[in-house]
C-alpha cells in the first residue's frame, strides 16, 4: 500500500510484511517488504531491515512472527527470542526495546510432530529522528513466511 | 513532543467483545457484542460479525481469542488458525490481513489434560469506506468465551 | 461517548517497565518502573502499580509478561492468568478489562525442562478521570523479570 509521508499532515505510520527475502541467515535483522500488498510507509523510511524515524516522538511499535517446524532442528536452542531493537547514530550497540522468549519446540512430543506458534510484541517507545528500529529472531530458522500476513513489523506515532 | 488533531473530530474506534452467540458453528466469522459491558462503536459500524469502515484511512486492527480444551477433540486439526480478514462489496473473496497459526493442543501430554492458550493479532491496514473486517478461527470449537474480556476484536484509526 | 482532542494538546501515553520490585508476593497487582530506561508517563500518572487516568477518553491499554520456569513448581495451578483490571472510585471491586489464560507449564515434558512463554494483551477501553488500571498475574511466581523489555504495561489515548 505504498507510501505517504506528507509533512505536517499525516500521522507517521508503517506496516511492513514478511517476504521470501526476509530471512538472510547472516545474523542480521529480518528484512521486510515495504511496498507490495499490505505493506506501506507513511512518514517513516526504511533501510536494510530498519524502520527509520523521520519525525521524533512516541511510537507504538509492533511485530509478529510466525514460528513453526517439524520437531526441533538439531542444535536448536530451546529458547526462541523475538525482539524489537533500536539503533541510534550516537551509540555503538543495539538497544533492546521489547523482547519475548518462547519455547515452542517443547510442544512437539515427538521428533516428527508438526507445531506452530506465534509471537506478538507491541509497546510505546520514544524515538528520535534518524533512529532505527529492527526485528531480530534467534533462531530465525523457525520463522515461517508465507504471504506477508503471518510475520510483520509496524509502527505509528501516538 | 506535541501532537495536533483538529478539534471536534472524533477518531474512529471500536472494541467488540465475545459473547455466547459469538460461535455460530456455521463456518462464518465470529459474531460480537457491540454495546453491552466494555463493547462500543465510535465512528465505525457493525454488521454480521464485521466491523464496517465509514471513513477511509489507516487503522490499527486487533483481535484476541482465548483457546482452551481438555485434551484434543477427535478430528481436530493440529493447527488452529486465527485471522483478521477483509471483505469488500466489489471483490468476491475475503482477503487475509493478519493471521496466526498455533498448535495449542500439542501442549497437553494426556488426553484428559486441561490446557489454555491465547492468540493475539494486531497491525495497521488501509481500509476504504464500506470495507468490512471480520475475525475467523479454525477450529472455532476451541474458542472459550466467558465475559467478553478473553476474546475480543477492535480497531482505531491511526 | 464523544471524545475531542484540542489542537496543541499532548496525547496521553505511558509505558511502564518491569523491575526487581515488580513482584510483591502480596497478592496485589504488579508494580512498575515509571521513569528509568524506557519507562515514561505523559498525561497519565502512576500510583501503587496503577496507571491513573487524568483525562477521560478511549485508551488502547496493553501489557506483556514474560513467563518462564524449570518444570512446574509444586502447587502451581496449571493455568496462568494475566489480566488488565480497572479500579474506579465509585465501585468497590476491580473490573476485568482484558484477560488471558495460558498453560505454559504443560510444554515441559520433564520436571527439569526449562521453558519460556509470553503473554500479550491489548485493547481499547473507555476510562474516566481518576480511574486506575492495573496488571495482575496469577501465579506471579512464573513472571521472569530482567531489564524492562520482557514485561511491561502501557497505554495511549486513541
Amino acid at each position: 500500500l505504498i507510501q505517504e509521508r506528507r509533512s505536517h499532515e499525516v500521522n507517521p505510520a508503517a506496516h511492513l510484511t514478511g517476504a521470501n527475502s526476509s530471512l538472510t541467515g547472516s545474523g542480521g535483522p529480518l528484512l521486510w517488504e515495504t511496498q507490495l500488498g499490505l505493506a506501506f510507509l507513511r512518514g517513516l523510511s526504511y533501510h536494510d531491515g530498519a524502520l527509520v524515524v523521520t519525525k521524533a516522538g512516541y511510537y507504538y511499535i509492533y511485530s509478529k512472527v510466525q514460528l513453526g517446524g517439524v520437531g526441533c532442528p538439531l542444535g536448536l536452542a530451546s529458547t526462541i527470542t523475538h525482539g524489537l531493537y533500536k539503533r541510534t547514530p550516537r551509540y555503538p550497540e543495539e538497544l533492546e526495546l521489547l523482547v519475548s522468549q518462547q519455547s515452542p519446540c517443547g510442544r512437539a512430543t515427538s521428533s516428527s510432530r508438526v507445531w506452530w506458534d506465534s509471537s506478538f510484541l507491541g509497546g510505546v517507545v520514544h524515538l528520535e529522528a534518524g533512529e532505527k528500529v529492527v526485528v531480530r529472531v534467534l533462531d530465525e530458522r523457525l520463522v515461517r513466511l508465507r504471504d506477508g500476513t503471518r510475520s510483520y513489523f509496524g509502527a505509528f506515532m501516538v | 513532543l506535541i501532537q495536533e488533531r483538529r478539534s471536534h473530530e472524533v477518531n474512529p474506534a471500536a472494541h467488540l467483545t465475545g459473547a455466547n452467540s459469538s460461535l455460530t458453528g456455521s463456518g462464518g466469522p465470529l459474531l460480537w457484542e457491540t454495546q453491552l459491558g466494555l463493547a462500543f462503536l465510535r465512528g465505525l459500524s457493525y454488521h454480521d460479525g464485521a466491523l464496517v469502515v465509514t471513513k477511509a484511512g489507516y487503522y490499527y486492527i486487533y483481535s484476541k481469542v482465548q483457546l482452551g480444551g481438555v485434551g484434543c477433540p477427535l478430528g481436530l486439526a493440529s493447527t488452529i488458525t486465527h485471522g483478521l480478514y477483509k471483505r469488500t462489496p466489489r471483490y468476491p473473496e475475503e482477503l487475509e490481513l493478519l493471521v496466526s497459526q498455533q498448535s495449542p493442543c500439542g501442549r497437553a501430554t494426556s488426553s484428559s489434560r486441561v490446557w489454555w492458550d491465547s492468540s493475539f493479532l494486531g497491525g495497521v491496514v488501509h481500509l476504504e469506506a464500506g470495507e468490512k473486517v471480520v475475525v475467523r478461527v479454525l477450529d472455532e470449537r476451541l474458542v472459550r468465551l466467558r465475559d467478553g474480556t478473553r476474546s475480543y476484536f477492535g480497531a482505531f484509526m491511526v | 461517548l464523544i471524545q475531542e482532542r484540542r489542537s496543541h494538546e499532548v496525547n496521553p501515553a505511558a509505558h511502564l517497565t518491569g523491575a526487581n520490585s515488580s513482584l510483591t508476593g502480596s497478592g496485589g497487582p504488579l508494580l512498575w518502573e515509571t521513569q528509568l530506561g524506557l519507562a515514561f508517563l505523559r498525561g497519565l500518572s502512576y500510583h501503587d502499580g496503577a496507571l491513573v487516568v487524568t483525562k477521560a477518553g478511549y485508551y488502547y491499554i496493553y501489557s506483556k509478561v514474560q513467563l518462564g520456569g524449570v518444570g512446574c513448581p509444586l502447587g502451581l495451578a496449571s493455568t496462568i492468568t494475566h489480566g488488565l483490571y480497572k479500579r474506579t472510585p465509585r465501585y468497590p471491586e476491580e473490573l476485568e478489562l482484558l484477560v488471558s489464560q495460558q498453560s505454559p507449564c504443560g510444554r515441559a515434558t520433564s520436571s527439569s525442562r526449562v521453558w519460556w512463554d509470553s503473554s500479550f494483551l491489548g485493547g481499547v477501553v473507555h476510562l474516566e478521570a481518576g480511574e486506575k488500571v492495573v496488571v495482575r498475574v496469577l501465579d506471579e511466581r512464573l513472571v521472569r523479570l530482567r531489564d524492562g523489555t520482557r514485561s511491561y504495561f502501557g497505554a495511549f489515548m486513541v
Epitope: I2, E4, R5, R6, Q35, L36, S45, H47 | R90 | -
Partner: antibody, heavy 118, light 107 residues
Framework: EIQLQQSGPDLVKPGASVKVSCKAS????????IYWVRQSHGKSLEWIGY????????KYNQKFKDTASLTVDKSSSTAFMHLNSLTSEDSAVYYC???????????WGQGTLVTVSA | DIVLTQSPATLSVTPGDSVSLSCRAS??????LHWYQQKSHESPRLLIK???QSISGIPSRFSGSGSGTDFTLTINSVETEDFGMYFC?????????FGAGTKLELK
Amino acid sequence: EIQLQQSGPDLVKPGASVKVSCKASGYSFTDYYIYWVRQSHGKSLEWIGYIDPYNGGTKYNQKFKDTASLTVDKSSSTAFMHLNSLTSEDSAVYYCARTSGSSWFPYWGQGTLVTVSA
Amino acid sequence: DIVLTQSPATLSVTPGDSVSLSCRASQSISNNLHWYQQKSHESPRLLIKYTYQSISGIPSRFSGSGSGTDFTLTINSVETEDFGMYFCQQSNRWPLTFGAGTKLELK
C-alpha cells in the same frame, strides 16, 4: 499542485550514456519514492526501479540493474536516472512516477524521449 | 516474473457502447492489480487501483472487478474521450509488471 517535470529529449550514440532528470514540486520531495518506467515505441511499460529520496535507498528490476543508476539531489528536489552502455534497444520514452498513500502511480512526469542512434 | 496478458489487443467500439477489457495474470496476484489509460503522446493516467477501488476525479463509468488471476475493466457507455490504450499493472511481486495493453478505438 503536484508536478514531476522531466528533462528534454536526448539523442545519443550506441555505447554512450545519458542522464534523465525529474524535478518534483508541490509536495515534500523526501516523503515519497520516485519510480522510473520506460515505454519503447508502440510497446508496453517496463518498471526500471525506484529510489527513496529520504535516504537514497534503491531497488531495481534485475533487467536494468547493469544499465540504470538512480540518484537524487534533495537540495533541488530532483531525481536522476543515469543510463549507460546504451543500445538501439534502449530507445524509448522514460517516465518518472510517484506513489500516493494507497495508490500506485497517480502522478507521472511528461516523459523523456531517449533515442539511441549512430 | 508475473506475466499479464491483456485481451483483446484491439477493441473497436461506438460511443455509447459498454465494453469489458480483460487482464489475466500468470499466477495469483490477489487484488493487487491496477488499470491505466494512456492517450497518444501523453503519460499514463491511473483509473482503478487494487482491482476495484475508484480514483478521485475518474468518471464513475470506469469500474474494475476480478480476483486471483482474472481481472476486468468495464467502461459503461464509452465516450469519445475514452479512446486510447489501456494497461493493467500488478503490485503483488517484484518486479512490477504491466500488460501489453488493449487499444480502444473508434469503430
